[in-house]
């Protein structure tokens, strides 16, 4: 740091005071120099450094008529707001040919009620769960202690005895104000006073109930919500994939969710009007009088294609001699997705029933074993898509054909006379 | 009862515009996405817009990019097709399209029954 | 964007008879989101299939889709004089939502 020397006598007349006092006071240190010839310019300094940006006045009074006269000369620092930062020891500085000179000291200190570094803040937490707060003061004068108030009510016996800096909360089952009180010497200081509203838990186990092909029944378990009950929750459903056009090189954005509310309870929730065989995802929150928990993650779900919602229509079974004619036509019904075949089961009195995949063939012809009648024969036939079987048809008697009866339109395949579709009572 | 009533068609002069409207009625209007297609005289089918439930997302054929804007007012049951400097080859019967599930921008499974939109001078 | 090119552009057939209309698309359509729609003049199409296989609600049974990828079908097994009309097959699964050029269905 510069150093006055001692070859010539200092310039300084008045050297800077001492300033203490609380944050935000302002104040001013002034030094007086007396100089022959040309005035030179003031610097500060604070603890040795050079002050570049103070904020100082400098007035030069001549003491007589020629320039080479005596100059009072007066500079005065203004300090606007005292902060932490501003404290040190104060000197002036001048320039005076090769030499260089400086002041006696003067010293700022900061004294009074403690200072708050860092406030709890407002926040929401979900029910019964743990969170933490924070809280830092400092002085002069240190020490510093805190006491932590939980709806205006102490959380220890005295200062300093509790939490300090952090205080952990394990859970809240309502919503409540948080503040700390910083001591010193000089007194006592609040901090705001956070709220810390209690939202309840999200949700858990969302999954899926039942599935159809244009609908979706989900529930989900709620999450605790302190002494607030639910209101109710919200269901948010998007395509997963959203349509996107990925061959088509731009993806579309992603669209906005549709949102459908559920009554509370039951946490269950029907999602109707869906694309059959589409995937998508959903997710819920549910809400008390504080406000919503946050979402559960995405769960993906797929409505599924379906049955036929039909049997297949007009079915006749005829039998000629040793083959039974049986033929029908598609369900007038929705097939709720892609049509992979057709089963036809049969069952004569006192035997077992006999089930066949004819495929996607609207007739069959059986090759009938033995000159036997054949007693109470029956047929069914149901429609089926990859999701399963449909309804099946309501049996139908087979009948024995008569001269002058139409034969079926289209031409029969006939069925391999195999043990497995033989029918070895006739 | 589902309907689509389409208005707001007529004459106008090429480079000038036109706004369509759409009066739905009969079904939750705000958690479909909903189309505008349409039809030059005797010619085929064209999509030229849709808009997703909340009218945040929106999607032009390349025909239109740029100067139609489709948007809609969930709170009216209403959606509209703004058409800014239109040309000859935007003579067209417009109709606006509800697609028959939740979600997905279509099949259309409902029609309203065209507004005629002739661009000429 | 997708283009779908249906075929034939004109069928000509009589009541009775099996119809068969294409449809094919140039890229993979997502999800088989694709419909088929019927329009008479002078109104407005008629939904008829959608997911290229299911059928709307009301549409006779000789009314069939099938398809997937980029290649579908729509048949109608017996052609009554009603079902005379153009047909129009269109993807959404990607934007934008293209149709095809349409299918004249006439009676012979």
């Known amino acids: 740091a510069p150093r006055g020397t001692q070859a010539e006598e200092s310039p300084f007349v008045g050297n800077p005071g001492n300033i203490t006092g609380a944050r935000g006071l302002t104040g001013t240190l002034r030094c007086q120099l007396q100089v022959q010839g040309e005035p030179p310019e003031v610097h500060w300094l604070r603890d040795g450094q050079i002050l570049e940006l103070a904020d100082s006045t400098q007035t030069q009074v001549p003491l007589g008529e020629d320039e080479q006269d005596d100059w009072i000369v007066v500079s005065q620092l203004r300090i606007t707001s005292l902060q932490l930062s501003d404290t040190g020891q104060y000197q002036c500085l001048v320039f005076l040919g090769h030499q260089t000179f400086v002041s006696q000291p003067g010293y700022v200190g900061l004294e009074g009620l403690p200072y708050f570094l860092e406030e709890p803040e407002d926040r929401t937490v979900a029910a019964n769960t743990p969170f933490n707060l924070s809280c830092q003061a400092q002085g002069p004068p240190e020490p510093v202690d805190l006491l932590w108030l939980q709806d205006a009510v102490p959380l220890a016996t005295a200062p300093g005895h509790g939490p300090q800096r952090s205080l952990h909360v394990p859970g809240l089952n309502k919503t409540s104000s948080f503040s700390c009180e910083a001591h010193n010497a000089k007194g006592v200081t609040t901090s705001r006073t956070a709220t810390i509203t209690v939202l309840p838990q999200q949700p858990r186990n969302l999954h899926l109930v039942s599935r159809q092909p244009t609908e979706l029944e989900v529930a989900w378990t709620p999450g605790l919500s302190g002494i607030y009950p639910l209101t109710h929750c919200t269901l948010q459903a998007v395509l997963s994939d959203d349509g996107m056009g990925i061959q088509a090189g731009e993806p579309d954005p992603p669209e906005e969710p549709l949102t459908s509310q559920a009554s509370v309870p039951p946490h269950q929730l029907r999602l109707g009007s869906l694309h059959p065989h589409t995937p998508y995802h959903i997710r819920v929150a549910c809400t008390s009088s504080q406000g919503p928990s946050s979402w559960t993650h995405w769960l993906p779900v797929e409505t599924p294609e379906g049955v036929p919602l039909g049997p297949p229509e007009n079915i006749s079974a005829t039998r000629n001699g040793s083959q039974a004619f049986v033929h029908w036509q598609e369900p007038r019904a929705p097939l709720q997705g892609t049509l992979l075949g057709y089963r036809l089961a049969y069952q004569g009195q006192d035997t077992p029933e006999v089930l066949m995949d004819i495929g996607l063939r609207q007739e069959v012809t059986l090759e009938l074993q033995g000159d036997g009648s054949v007693s109470n024969l029956t047929v069914c036939v149901a429609a089926y898509t990859a999701a399963g079987d449909g309804p099946w048809s309501l049996p139908v008697p087979l009948e024995a054909w008569r001269p002058g009866q139409a034969q079926p339109v289209h031409q029969l395949v006939k069925e391999p006379s195999t043990p497995a579709f033989s029918w070895p009572w006739w | 009862e589902v309907q689509l009533l389409d208005s707001g068609g007529g004459l106008v002069q090429p480079g000038g515009s036109l706004r369509l409207s759409c009066a739905a009625s009969?079904?939750?209007?705000?958690?479909?996405?909903m189309s505008w297609v349409r039809q030059a005289p005797g010619k085929g089918l064209e999509w030229v817009s849709a808009?997703?439930?909340?009218?945040?997302?929106?999607y032009y054929a390349d025909s239109v990019k740029g100067r139609f804007t489709i948007s809609r007012d969930n709170s009216k049951n209403t959606l509209y097709l703004q058409m800014n400097s239109l040309r000859a080859a935007d003579t067209a019967v417009y109709y606006c399209?509800?697609?028959?599930?939740?979600?997905?921008?279509?099949?259309?499974?409902?029609w309203g029954q065209g507004a005629l939109v002739t661009v000429s001078s | 964007e997708i283009v779908l090119t249906q075929s034939p552009g004109t069928l000509s057939l009589s009541p009775g008879e099996r119809a068969t209309l294409s449809c094919r698309a140039s890229?993979?359509?997502?999800?088989?989101?694709l419909a088929w729609y019927q329009q008479k003049p002078g109104q407005a199409p008629r939904l008829l299939i959608y997911?290229?296989?299911s059928r709307a609600t009301g549409i006779p049974d000789r009314f069939s889709g099938s398809g997937s990828g980029t290649d579908f079908t729509l048949t109608i097994s017996r052609l009554e004089p009603e079902d005379f009309a153009v047909y129009y097959c269109?993807?959404?699964?990607?934007?934008?939502?293209?149709f095809g050029q349409g299918t004249k269905l006439e009676i012979k």
């Open positions: 399209a509800k697609p028959g599930f939740i979600l997905v921008r279509g099949p259309l499974d409902y």
């Open positions: 009969g079904f939750t209007f705000s958690s479909y996405a």
């Open positions: 808009i997703s439930i909340g009218g945040g997302n929106a």
């Open positions: 890229q993979s359509v997502s999800n088989s989101y």
């Open positions: 997911g290229a296989s």
């Open positions: 269109q993807q959404y699964g990607s934007s934008p939502y293209t």
